[in-house]
């Protein structure tokens, strides 16, 4: 297993609709054709694999399990979007990238993106 650098933004604020997007960029040492991306959440004294996708370079990312994640890839960048977030989902979201094929296998783990989620205030009743 060889190490690889992964960069991601330090902080992202989710939209009022509970959607957060960030870019995960990896320094690919070679010409990988198969890449696996996993988003980990580290908070509340637990570590959760939020979503994972394996993709062939140049193709769409396909997430399984009715995933709350979607994403696109462009070169060594993965544009990740997490939806359906609520205030309790606030935490550190870490991007893990694995170059699966061809060998050698490379693994890179980012420092994490702190995603802040604020639940929207309910709209007040109006006479208008």
């Amino acid at each position: 297993c060889k190490a690889m650098h992964v960069a991601q933004p330090a902080v992202v604020l989710a939209s009022s609709r509970g959607i957060a997007s960030f870019v995960c960029e990896y320094a690919s040492p070679g010409k990988a054709t198969e890449v696996r991306v996993t988003v980990l959440r580290q908070a509340d004294s637990q570590v959760t694999e939020v979503c994972a996708a394996t993709y062939m370079m140049g193709n769409e990312l396909t997430f399984l399990d009715d995933s709350i994640c979607t994403g696109t890839s462009s070169g060594n960048q993965v544009n990740l979007t997490i939806q359906g977030l609520r205030a309790m989902d606030t935490g550190l979201y870490i991007c893990k990238v694995e170059l699966m094929y061809p060998p050698p296998y490379y693994l890179g783990i980012g420092n994490g993106t702190q995603i802040y989620v604020i639940d929207p205030e309910p709209c007040p009743d109006s006479d208008f």
Partner: nanobody
Framework: EVQLVESGGGLVQAGGSLRLSCVAS?????????MAWFRQAPGKEREFAAA????????SYADSVKGRFTISRDNAKNTVYLQMNSLKPEDAARYYC?????????????????WGQGTQVTVSS
Amino acid sequence: EVQLVESGGGLVQAGGSLRLSCVASAEGSFSTYVMAWFRQAPGKEREFAAAISGRSGLTSYADSVKGRFTISRDNAKNTVYLQMNSLKPEDAARYYCAADRRAWSARPDMGNYYWGQGTQVTVSS
């Protein structure tokens, strides 16, 4: 409605291992359920230990068990497992299997779970 039956608990020495099993009788496909293990020690609140998603096997672990416990599932057998290694006296508790029919999320510890009756794990020092 889901019926959950746990097994595999018992008495083990500190540093030892146990494998818990939970068989589910579920409405619809077992693979659509998020499965989890919680535990409750005497006089303490029930706490999250681990969870696993339906099809792709995404996992979540409490910091207190990560690296020692492994959750897995066999959808063909409607069964979820908790392999517990390097057990400590503080792991002693009643372990509950839980099932939640919803999509995987960033907080699988917070779900609308169906519960089993639990299986007792005792760790002697």
